[in-house]
């Protein structure tokens, strides 16, 4: 095992900026921090096959799949996607690791699938497998929160029936007018579904997930109806 190269697989997620970078590139565009994909040796596979955690991205996202190889000497490589071979230009970083990158621009269904990277080094040959799919955001919803009084307790539950499950927070303000803006020092935020002590002149519950944030204001009349 210690004879095998140390492989690091990362995903780089790019902010969409209509850059005209080619499909396979050694120098990806300016982007967010690399995200480790937990590359692991695939058990019971013929040959040395590493697999990266499954990548799930939004449609139209631009990403880079990148492999860093800690192996002595030169490396040569080849990308294969849906039976097509794609050229590969490895380069070396400051730590003398071989770096191989595949840039996928504006992700579409046709670009989803298995990306195989074949690497040949002086010591050994191995394959790295990336699986890229498009996240199904059609199922995502963000609904405005509503309130329910807890049975036998002097407490309120804030509910938002959203997918993925939202983060729910109470926003409480004990002041009048302008000073109840969210950045105001008069505002108290509690990131919990259940509120045990009601205080303030302005009480709201907010739910947020990947689709954004929705808030509902609690009026005194609601307390009698929940």
């Amino acid at each position: 095992n210690q004879d095998l190269p140390v492989i690091k697989c990362v995903l780089i997620n790019h902010k969409n900026n209509d850059s005209s970078v080619g499909k396979s590139s050694s120098y990806p565009m300016v982007s967010e921090s690399p995200e480790d994909l937990g590359c692991a040796l695939r058990p019971q596979s013929s040959g040395t096959v590493y697999e990266a955690a499954a990548v799930e991205v939004d449609v139209s996202a631009s990403i880079t799949l990148q492999v860093l190889v800690d192996a002595p000497g030169n490396i040569s490589c080849l990308w294969v996607f849906k039976h097509s071979s794609l050229n590969c230009q490895p380069h070396f970083d400051l730590q003398n690791r071989g770096v191989v990158s595949m840039v996928i621009l504006k992700m579409t269904e046709t670009q989803a699938g298995e990306y195989l990277l074949f690497i040949q080094s002086e010591a050994t040959n191995y394959t790295i497998l990336f699986t890229v799919s498009i996240r199904n955001t059609l199922l995502y919803t963000l609904r405005r929160p509503y309130f329910r009084k807890m049975e036998n307790q002097d407490a309120l539950v804030c509910i938002s029936e959203s997918v993925p499950e939202p983060i729910v927070e109470w926003v409480l303000c004990d002041s009048q007018g302008e000073s109840c803006k969210e950045e105001s020092p008069a505002v108290v935020k509690k990131e919990e579904k259940v509120l045990h002590e009601l205080f303030g002149t302005d009480i709201r519950c907010c739910a947020r997930n990947e689709l954004g944030r929705e808030c509902t204001r609690l009026f005194t009349i609601d307390l009698n109806q929940t």
């Epitope: 937990g38 058990p43 955690a53 990548v55 799930e56």
Partner: antibody, heavy 127, light 107 residues
Framework: QVTLKESGPVLVKPTETLTLTCTVS??????????VTWIRQPPGKALEWLAH???????SYSTSLKSRLTISKDTSKSQVVLTMTNMDPVDTATYYC???????????????????WGQGTMVTVSS | DIQMTQSPSSLSASVGDRVTITCRAS??????LGWYQQKPGKAPKRLIY???TLQSGVPSRFSGSGSGTEFTLTISSLQPEDFATYYC?????????FGQGTKVEIK
């Protein structure tokens, strides 16, 4: 570099609710099939799996503690939160969070368990 | 729930010894098993996954075998840094469960 860091109260009173936060860096809970799990270890005892949550919001809980546990994630803060209600002195333990990468198997996913762990946070339950 | 029974619960050995730890599952778990090493005051570290695949960076003196209900962790030649507690973990079905641990001590 992949890191996970647990944070939360050092001391909790019996019957109170414990809220623990796992802040992750070096990997994402959005763009890859990744999970975060919670494990605990009472002093001098074995490891006990508590719960986990995946990037697709799939969750699982320990059978014996299911009624007391809630796991959630806040991807914008790269955090996973575990709450445990009605704490008791027997819940005194070191609580760890760890990462679980998910690998594609056709239309399904496969997990090899936890590959990277946080350093743990000790929680004492006492009045 | 699947019960994982580890044996022995502790053992004494000398540097250079061959050490074998066994983990038995109460029902078949294919090869959905990992081995973890834990040193006092530290977090566990994965040694083996999928019953027999060595984690990257782990010395080759560690090896795992087995499938179904019987699994083994072997340290071919015990080194001073190997004195620790070892746990097996099944991740075949929920809830995931650990063995009770095997403490490897210096003879």
């Amino acid at each position: 570099q992949v890191t996970l860091k647990e944070s939360g109260p050092v001391l909790v009173k019996p019957t109170e609710t414990l809220t623990l936060t796992c802040t992750v860096s070096g990997f994402s809970l959005i763009n890859a099939r990744m999970g975060v799990t919670w494990i605990r270890q009472p002093p001098g005892k074995a490891l006990e799996w508590l719960a986990h949550i995946f990037s697709n919001d799939e969750k699982s809980y320990s059978t014996s503690l299911k009624s007391r546990l809630t796991i959630s994630k806040d991807t914008s803060k790269s955090q996973v939160v575990l709450t445990m209600t009605n704490m008791d002195p027997v819940d005194t333990a070191t609580y760890y969070c760890a990462r679980i990468p998910g690998y594609s198997r056709g239309w399904d996913y496969y997990y090899y368990g936890m590959d990277v762990w946080g350093q743990g946070t000790m929680v004492t339950v006492s009045s | 729930d699947i019960q994982m029974t580890q044996s022995p619960s502790s053992l004494s050995a000398s540097v250079g010894d061959r050490v074998t730890i066994t983990c038995r599952a109460s029902q078949g778990i294919r090869n959905d098993l990992g081995w973890y090493q834990q040193k006092p005051g530290k977090a566990p570290k994965r040694l083996i996954y999928a019953a027999s695949t060595l984690q990257s960076g782990v010395p080759s003196r560690f090896s795992g075998s087995g499938s179904g209900t019987e699994f083994t962790l072997t340290i071919s030649s015990l080194q001073p840094e190997d004195f620790a507690t070892y746990y097996c973990l099944q991740h075949n079905s929920y809830p995931w469960t650990f063995g009770q641990g095997t403490k490897v001590e210096i003879k």
